[in-house]
């Protein structure tokens, strides 16, 4: 809901609901937070009949699930809302879906957001 700022890290920012939320639609988001916390970037998107619809991108809080991930990759099998997080400036510019399946070999579905 509410935007913050910092000098520690930058992530690609996007908000599909920018008009309703009265935020920018896209840009660079400086991340902020307590000095003892790690910062991450994230991307959230939907796959509507094969069409990728980005929901949000930006900074993410200290999250062990994001540690040491240089690439933004969703590994859950067929979620309704896709989510990935990563470490490194602007690491959420590209995001991918590599479902973790026991039998089937995972396939790469890299996604690069189109400029608005």
């Amino acid at each position: 809901a509410i935007l913050g700022r910092s000098e520690t890290q930058e992530c690609l920012f996007f908000n599909a609901n920018w008009e309703r939320d009265r935020t920018n639609q896209t840009g660079v988001e400086p991340c902020y937070g307590d000095k003892d916390k790690r910062r991450h970037c994230f991307a959230t998107w939907k796959n509507i009949s094969g069409s990728i619809e980005i929901v949000k991108q930006g900074c993410w809080l200290d999250d062990i699930n994001c540690y040491d991930r240089t690439d933004c990759i969703e590994k859950k099998d067929s979620p309704e809302v896709y989510f990935c997080c990563c470490e490194g400036n602007m690491c959420n510019e590209k995001f991918s879906y590599f479902p973790e399946m026991e039998v089937t070999q995972p396939t790469s579905n890299p996604v690069t957001p189109k400029p608005p």
Epitope: L3, G4, Y32, W60, P79
Partner: antibody, heavy 120, light 107 residues
Framework: EVQLLESGGGLVQPGGSLRLSCAAS????????MNWVRQAPGKGLEWVSG????????SYADSVKGRFTISRDNSKNTLYLQMNSLRAEDTAVYYC?????????????WGQGTLVTVSS | DIQMTQSPSSLSASVGDRVTITCRAS??????LNWYQQKPGKAPKLVIY???SLASGVPSRFSGSGSGTDFTLTISSLQPEDFATYYC?????????FGGGTKVEIK
């Protein structure tokens, strides 16, 4: 140590106005979004309003839209909630809370709350 | 608005018990789910954020799990100071919404 201290609550008649304040200390206030959350007596939590780090973006619950205004003064490290046209159902303890990022708003620090009673 | 439904609304447990509270969202919210603890007359306190991450200063007996629509807060071994009301909250979309709360009482 992060501290948030609300003030300005009290008894007000229906249709009246009240201005709540939240004094912040122990962190760089101008780096953080802030929110107001309320809790009616014996009830659960209800988000009321939020504002981003520089006051450029604000958001309101439908129940208070057009009646309440959130604002901040970063030079004074203070958050405000101007409440107009108050109704009995606005009676609650009002908490200010520090926000995380706009998209994953975990409220990591809260004030102790200030009670607003709307009654004739 | 996204509706958050908690269950149970209250439960009785003993010190040392394993306690599980569930929260269901009316639509998928990915991992945008936070948990708060509130004691009578006190402000809420953040316990878990982003569905699974432990907030600063919170004991490791608290854990969160889930993604999408179904989430769980677990207290592995209930301590006397854990008796309180717990709320889930979604931050996927405006307005931010809370569950109705789960009161954990002493058996």
């Amino acid at each position: 140590e992060v501290q948030l201290l609300e003030s300005g609550g009290g008894l007000v008649q229906p249709g009246g106005s009240l201005r709540l304040s939240c004094a912040a200390s122990g962190f760089t206030f101008s780096d953080y979004g802030m929110n107001w959350v309320r809790q009616a007596p014996g009830k659960g939590l209800e988000w009321v309003s939020g504002i981003n780090y520089n006051g450029g973006y604000t958001s309101y619950a439908d129940s208070v839209k057009g009646r309440f205004t959130i604002s901040r003064d970063n030079s004074k490290n203070t958050l405000y909630l101007q409440m107009n046209s108050l109704r009995a159902e606005d009676t609650a303890v009002y908490y200010c809370a520090r926000a995380a990022n706009w998209h994953d708003t975990a409220l990591d620090y809260w004030g102790q709350g200030t009670l607003v009673t709307v009654s004739s | 608005d996204i509706q958050m439904t908690q269950s149970p609304s209250s439960l009785s447990a003993s010190v040392g018990d394993r306690v599980t509270i569930t929260c269901r969202a009316s639509q998928s919210i990915s991992r945008y789910l936070n948990w708060y603890q509130q004691k009578p007359g006190k402000a809420p306190k953040l316990v878990i954020y982003a569905a699974t991450s432990l907030a600063s200063g919170v004991p490791s007996r608290f854990s969160g799990s889930g993604s999408g629509t179904d989430f769980t807060l677990t207290i592995s071994s209930l301590q006397p100071e854990d008796f309180a009301t717990y709320y889930c909250q979604q931050s996927y979309d405006n307005p931010l919404t809370f569950g109705g709360g789960t009161k954990v009482e002493i058996k």
